[in-house]
Amino acid sequence: NSLFNQEVQIPLTESYCGPCPKNWICYKNNCYQFFDESKNWYESQASCMSQNASLLKVYSKEDQDLLKLVKSYHWMGLVHIPTNGSWQWEDGSILSPNLLTIIEMQKGDCALYASSFKGYIENCSTPNTYICMQRTV
Amino acid sequence: NSLFNQEVQIPLTESYCGPCPKNWICYKNNCYQFFDESKNWYESQASCMSQNASLLKVYSKEDQDLLKLVKSYHWMGLVHIPTNGSWQWEDGSILSPNLLTIIEMQKGDCALYASSFKGYIENCSTPNTYICMQRTV
């Protein structure tokens, strides 16, 4: 148990969120971090992976309603598979119906998250800020 | 100790955030919630108080850097004191210099928070969405 060093007691009226990497946003037991530095999609993915996280996966408007108020455009983990014409997440799962409105501003196989559950198609090599996410167990 | 019912162990590499009211956003041990319903400033303040919270107080660009990405306009706990012409928070503390850029779009004694640490002056009776905040101890 050497990895564990804190013991906390939690009031019934309130709850702790996490665990998350230090100084990440915790919401409904998911962890989020917004990164300011602009990277292409692949570099953004690598950055998230290096922190035991992945690029943002949108799976629920209810559990992730904090995302509707996010300003600007940020890489998320959604990629286009040209051979079968599908948008899917890094983990291989298909985009769930009615979650995102995909807007094709230009040709590309990666997608930027924008407020109100919109996804903007972008060339994967274009530098952008990005959102990492870690789902707690 | 009847109010406490959970005991959790936290890995050193990660940390829990809070405690916060259930389903609030937790960031750097502060709790935030964005409310969709439009209320005037006084109703917004009452709503936050009923949840043992206050309207948003901006006290640190570093500790509250998640606020820079907030879209739209929301009541915060900043009010204008006509007698001395200062802007102060609900708790009576004066607005620290260089924290917010105050923009006088119209006459008013209340302020809306907008992204990138801007405050828009607004009539206190105008309905707007609002942000509640609870600082953890």
Epitope: H80, I81, N84, G85, S86, L95, I102, K107 | -
Partner: antibody, heavy 121, light 107 residues
Framework: EVQLLESGGGLVQPGGSLRLSCATS????????MSWVRQAPGKGLEWVSY????????DYADSVKGRFTISRDNSKNTLYLQMNSLRAEDTAVYYC??????????????WGQGTLVTVSS | DIQLTQSPSFLSASVGDRVTITCRAS??????LAWYQQKPGKAPKLLIY???SLESGVPSRFSGSGSGTDFTLTISSLQPEDFATYYC?????????FGQGTRLEIK
């Protein structure tokens, strides 16, 4: 086995309306993009409209924009095409088609047998 | 809109022949090209997608190649059931467009 079955075609006067339906089975309807493609007698194929529930998008050929509306009922696994202000040049066999993925970039993987729409006075 | 021009529009060939149909796009479409076969009174059938991928269940005598603006469909050895009309289709951008078709008839 994937099946697409169109219905609702027939004879209609210019300016009239028709609603085509495409009942589907054998796949998870809501996960796939669907299109309507038409073929005028003795002519080639013309794409009409596209709908993807997953990616929240819809599009139309210029020739039908503002007159035709594509929709779907995922609970009934059915695709629809509401056709208003019909013209003689809309006369064609209308095919319902399933894309191979959830976006229009996927090829037309499966086709229905078609339903004939005739616009004539 | 992206125009697709197929050539030839009409082709007469014999069983056992090697046949090539070309499809030229008015602008680059990467590999977003599919080929379909249609027989009279029937719905089209997907043969090739992503320019060169063979659809499951389609005989290996059919093959596709190309990228960008120039694409080809090749039938290595014509069989009697291959006599039909063939269409190329691009899905690089909407509106989705088809070539005008190539009618393949028995010589």
């Amino acid at each position: 086995e994937v099946q697409l079955l169109e219905s609702g075609g027939g004879l209609v006067q210019p300016g009239g309306s028709l609603r085509l339906s495409c009942a589907t089975s054998g796949f998870t309807f809501s996960d796939y993009a669907m299109s309507w493609v038409r073929q005028a007698p003795g002519k080639g194929l013309e794409w009409v409209s596209y709908n993807s529930f997953s990616v929240g998008s819809t599009d139309y050929a210029d020739s039908v924009k503002g007159r035709f509306t594509i929709s779907r009922d995922n609970s009934k696994n059915t695709l629809y095409l509401q056709m208003n202000s019909l013209r003689a040049e809309d006369t064609a066999v209308y095919y319902c088609s399933k894309h191979s993925g959830n976006y229009y970039t996927g090829p037309f993987h499966y086709w229905g047998q078609g339903t004939l729409v005739t616009v004539s006075s | 809109d992206i125009q697709l021009t197929q050539s030839p529009s009409f082709l007469s060939a014999s069983v056992g022949d090697r046949v090539t149909i070309t499809c030229r796009a008015s602008q680059g479409i990467s590999s977003y090209l599919a080929w379909y076969q249609q027989k009279p009174g029937k719905a089209p059938k997907l043969l090739i997608y992503a320019a060169s991928s063979l659809e499951s269940g389609v005989p290996s005598r059919f093959s596709g190649s190309g990228s960008g603006t120039d694409f080809t469909l090749t039938i290595s050895s014509l069989q009697p059931e291959d006599f039909a009309t063939y269409y190329c289709q691009q899905s690089y951008s909407t509106p989705i467009t088809f070539g005008q078709g190539t009618r393949l008839e028995i010589k």
